[in-house]
Interface confidence: low
């Protein structure tokens, strides 16, 4: 807490300008009017205040707005935002996307701080759902943001927001998250033609069911191995050798390098060795010739 002292004669600040950087902490406290500071917050960022001087400015705003800052002030906090604690931010009501962008910009290039996490929490809570513009903004600053959401939370993301998602935004998503996102992506991109559709849907295919993979295999999509390896094992297992060959196109040769890894390993175990041999890749582990293959799932359905 800064001690209350009278402002020296002639030092009363008439505006927020560069001359204030030469003020001592106690002079800033005594000579800068909090209301003046609030109305000229947009100037603070252009002035190289020290870390400790910013503490004083924050203290003045805290005194003026004990219940939380108004959005007109929040939008122009600039580097003063870095002085805010999560408990300060919890008092705010941030509704403008421009305000959110301005504050995220301050933290750009750094890990998501506790302050930023709280800010996003408050903003999304205020909006009620993760709309396209918000998602676009958040993933631009924090590519992993989408994958930090629970499947339940992702379920409230409207399909229109999926257009904002870039492939790198899904890098850390797990299968449960992709299970939720894939149907939304399918809906969002449904009016695109074959090749364009595949480019857009590719990142979401970790949530695709078997029937959709079968459909894709008829469209000469040439799926790369990295995408294939992220597919759900249960969705890959029912695919025939011919379907996988069509799905991967020239990339089918990559199966050899991945034959010990899921889902390739499990898929191989389900195929006839005869069929695997037609690929000419030397894949081993298929069902030997002459063995009877029982489709247990069909048997259960019949009983």
């Amino acid at each position: 807490e800064v001690e209350k002292t009278a402002c020296p004669s002639g030092k009363k600040a008439r505006e927020i300008d560069e001359s204030l950087i030469f003020y001592k902490k106690w002079e800033l406290e005594a000579c800068v009017d909090a209301a003046l500071l609030a109305t000229q917050m947009d100037r603070v960022n252009a002035i190289p205040f020290t870390y400790e001087q910013l503490d004083v400015l924050k203290h003045k705003l805290d005194e003026l707005y004990p219940q939380g800052y108004p959005e007109s002030v929040i939008q122009h906090l600039g580097y003063l935002f870095l002085k805010m604690s999560p408990e300060d931010i919890r008092k705010w009501n941030v509704t403008s996307l421009e305000t959110l962008k301005a504050l995220l910009e301050v933290n750009k290039g750094h890990e998501m701080s506790p302050q930023v996490a709280t800010l996003i929490d408050r903003f999304v809570k205020g909006r009620g759902q993760l709309d396209k513009d918000t998602l676009d903004t958040l993933t631009a600053f924090y590519p992993g943001y989408l994958c930090s959401l629970s499947p339940e939370e992702l379920s409230s993301v409207p399909p229109s927001s999926i257009w904002a998602v870039r492939p790198q935004d899904l890098d850390t998503c797990d299968p449960r998250q992709l299970d939720v996102l894939y149907p939304k992506a399918r809906l969002a991109f449904q009016n695109m033609n074959g090749s364009e559709y595949f480019v857009k849907i590719q990142s979401f295919l970790g949530g695709a069911p078997t029937e959709d993979l079968k459909a894709l295999s008829q469209q000469n999509v040439s799926m790369d191995l990295a995408t294939f390896m992220k597919l759900r094992t249960d969705a890959v297992l029912p695919l025939t050798v011919a379907e996988v060959q069509k799905l991967l196109g020239p990339h089918v040769e990559g199966l050899k390098a991945e034959e010990r890894h899921r889902p390739v390993r499990d898929w191989i175990l389900r195929q006839r060795q005869d069929d695997l041999d037609t690929l000419g890749l030397g894949l081993q582990g298929g069902i030997p010739n002459g063995y009877l293959v029982l489709d247990l799932s069909m048997q259960e359905a019949l009983s």
Epitope: Y51, K83, S85, P86, E87, R90, H110, E111, M112, S113, P114, A117, T118, D121, V124, K125, S148, L149, S150, E152, E153
Partner: antibody, heavy 120, light 107 residues
């Protein structure tokens, strides 16, 4: 009285997964972020990640991304941490700890710890 | 990541001593620092938050000081029940990081 009650000790084989629970009582579960911290022999405390119970949104220490998955069940006021592809390096005591923003985001309440032993 | 360095792994002390445990941050963390006490077989307990604020119920012989990069936890009148490990932690930015700890032992 605030309490974070963690699940009991675990002995698991390498390659397996384990899910540790942390049941909160005595306060509003969704009002406070929940952190997970690792304490291994001869090492300091390591922060694993934090989850916001209100939304299930989480943030991880880069070192534990892919290793740990944090979830919550609001209905039972319980936080969970799943650790997968376990190795002997994962043998440690794991704590859940409440992050109270009033106290400057410090960890003001800790569970009693869950000892995980990974051994064949 | 911000590295929190507690240079003294062990400190020998006697009852009634004034003990100062130091912690240095690799970059400016303001006052976003907490101190914890951990006794054998127990979980850590919060002593100090925001570098110098004593947590509810913590005896006033424990005081925290410092800001920026250098922090000190002082026990003004060492008691036998204070024999424990003490950790500093920064929460200025993710990932949250802890010091390696300082163990107080009897001389």
């Amino acid at each position: 009285e605030f309490q974070l009650q963690q699940s009991g000790p675990e002995l698991v084989k390498p390659g397996a997964s384990v899910k540790i629970s942390c049941k909160a009582s005595g306060y509003s579960f969704t009002d406070y972020n929940m952190n997970w911290v690792k304490l291994s022999n001869g090492k300091s405390l390591e922060w694993i990640g934090v989850i916001i119970p209100n939304y299930g949104t989480s943030s991880y220490n880069q070192k534990f991304k892919g290793k740990a998955t944090l979830t919550v069940d609001q209905s039972s006021s319980t936080a969970y941490m799943q650790l997968n592809s376990l190795t002997s390096e994962d043998s440690a005591v794991y704590y859940c700890a409440r992050w109270d923003n009033y106290y400057g985001s410090s960890l003001d309440y800790w569970g009693q710890g869950t000892t995980l032993t990974v051994s064949s | 990541d911000i590295v929190m360095t507690q240079s003294q792994k062990f400190m020998s002390t006697t009852v009634g001593d004034r003990v100062s445990i130091t912690c240095k941050a690799s970059q400016n963390v303001g006052t976003a620092v907490a101190w914890y006490q951990q006794k054998p077989g127990q979980s850590p307990k919060l002593l100090i938050y925001s570098a110098s604020n004593r947590y509810t119920g913590v005896p006033d012989r424990f005081t925290g000081s410092g800001s920026g990069t250098d922090f000190i936890l002082t026990i003004s009148n060492m008691q036998s029940e204070d024999l424990a490990d003490y950790f500093c932690q920064q929460y200025s930015s993710y990932p949250l990081t802890f010091g390696a700890g300082t163990k107080l032992e009897l001389k």
